[in-house]
Interface confidence: low
Amino acid sequence: AGVFELQIHSFGPGPGPGAPRSPCSARLPCRLFFRVCLKPGLSEEAAESPCALGAALSARGPVYTEQPGAPAPDLPLPDGLLQVPFRDAWPGTFSFIIETWREELGDQIGGPAWSLLARVAGRRRLAAGGPWARDIQRAGAWELRFSYRARCEPPAVGTACTRLCRPRSAPSRCGPGLRPCAPLEDECEAPLVCRAGCSPEHGFCEQPGECRCLEGWTGPLCTVPVSTSSCLSPRGPSSATTGCLVPGPGPCDGNPCANGGSCSETPRSFECTCPRGFYGLRCEVSGVTCADGPCFNGGLCVGGADPDSAYICHCPPGFQGSNCEKRVDRCSLQPCRNGGLCLDLGHALRCRCRAGFAGPRCEHDLDDCAGRACANGGTCVEGGGAHRCSCALGFGGRDCRERADPCAARPCAHGGRCYAHFSGLVCACAPGYMGARCEFPVHPDGASALPAAPPGLRPGDPQRYL
């Protein structure tokens, strides 16, 4: 057992051009808080997958209001460390996600609103008990500077927090067969309960007599590296040429346990220890029920009709997703017609209509063409709050009073020449091009004739000529 500790040093604009706008303003003061999510191993997991090693949330930082005209500085941070306790062995390799959240303190309906400002992720190797590791991560135009470490909680010690230390019973020496506990020389290593010979650095146990391996190690005593680059010959691992001990594929290789489950070898196969909410041979079945409160944001949980859907979340207005976890951008459905501006007020949607339109969704078109005339046989078209003329051929301008030059827009592609004509325009194409606007090459591959297939390609194979 132990604690992963994260210290945020700064969060602000990164170097280089394109400094981000301050997330806070005089009208909308805000404050930051951070969330860290830890997962064992080096697997590239989705941000939504469980934080199997644990997660923590910081306190909220001081309220910040942008000074008008000033660039976004480093933003004021919450006090203290983020601490993620871990109950089992420290895995040595881990993935992290650190999120910077903004809490808006302005005139929010129903209390403060919060939104994700930046998310950084990484994969690291880290021994417990070591010094603070420093890191800089960038997310878009933002930069996050932080330090982290893993430390064991007494009586655990070691790089994986798996060795146990107890205070000495006698002042001078430890009991028979027990060594002093480095670096705590005044303490003694507790009696070994793991399988005899289990590697103290790469193995650990939770039950007497077992030996479970940290990531990257295998074998009954966790003494065999899963793969060592020095053991790789051009044709793959070969113990004969290099003297390396090459393990056969183990049942836990590639971790068959889904959803953050941990794998342990059994005499015949493997066994998955699943995190809460999952079960099945490979932790592939979600056992979450309404009792686990899976619905966010006030979603109402109802037991599912079949075993594969243990619950269904009925989301309140403004939220969606299987767990009501996504705030609906109701304006993304573009409910305002005719170019109206959509405003999501939380409790309601509003449309701000352009001139010439009215109604809750700007659906009513006020009559723009009344009393308007288009010259030279043009017809008036309503729309956008201002009349528009659709002009007859050869005329243009707002009221169709101007003679149009159909060649002014250079409509002929690839060097074709344009000629005005009573019926519109005509393009005279350059050699090698054809079409009403000279848009088509006569030979699409750019050659005058298709060449023979290059050596090694059979006729009918896909070909690309550069």
Epitope: C37, L57, G110, G293, C295, F296, N297, G298, G346
Partner: nanobody
Framework: QVQLQESGGGLVQAGGSLRLSCAAP????????MGWYRQAPGKQRELVAV???????NYADSVKGRFTISRDNAKNTVYLQMNSLKPEDTGVYYC?????????WGQGTQVTVSS
């Protein structure tokens, strides 16, 4: 694990009222969806009421019109005002905080409604 501290349970006559309180750490309160669940003897835990960080509320059909959930952001506390209590409201009432993919539970407070 975040500590959620419930209080306010007890023994009450049918038709009476109780007010349950649940205090949560300030670091999560303002962003958590807070809920009350109950578990009657021999039954599954069920949702009673939920209030989101935006203060929108949801209630189980069986308590609509009788129970009211509210939150005091200054005190980091969520309340469940229970009026017109019935014997079937008897059970252990659990406070619940949901934020990100975390779900934290209180220890529970016993509510007994006698007829």
């Amino acid at each position: 694990q975040v500590q959620l501290q419930e209080s306010g349970g007890g023994l009450v006559q049918a038709g009476g009222s109780l007010r349950l309180s649940c205090a949560a750490p300030g670091s999560i309160f303002s962003i958590a969806s807070m809920g009350w669940y109950r578990q009657a003897p021999g039954k599954q835990r069920e949702l009673v009421a939920v209030i989101t960080s935006f203060s929108s509320t949801n209630y189980a059909d069986s308590v609509k019109g009788r129970f009211t959930i509210s939150r005091d952001n200054a005190k980091n506390t969520v309340y469940l005002q229970m009026n017109s209590l019935k014997p079937e409201d008897t059970g252990v009432y659990y406070c619940n905080a949901r934020y990100f993919e975390r779900t934290d539970w209180g220890q529970g407070t016993q509510v007994t409604v006698s007829s």
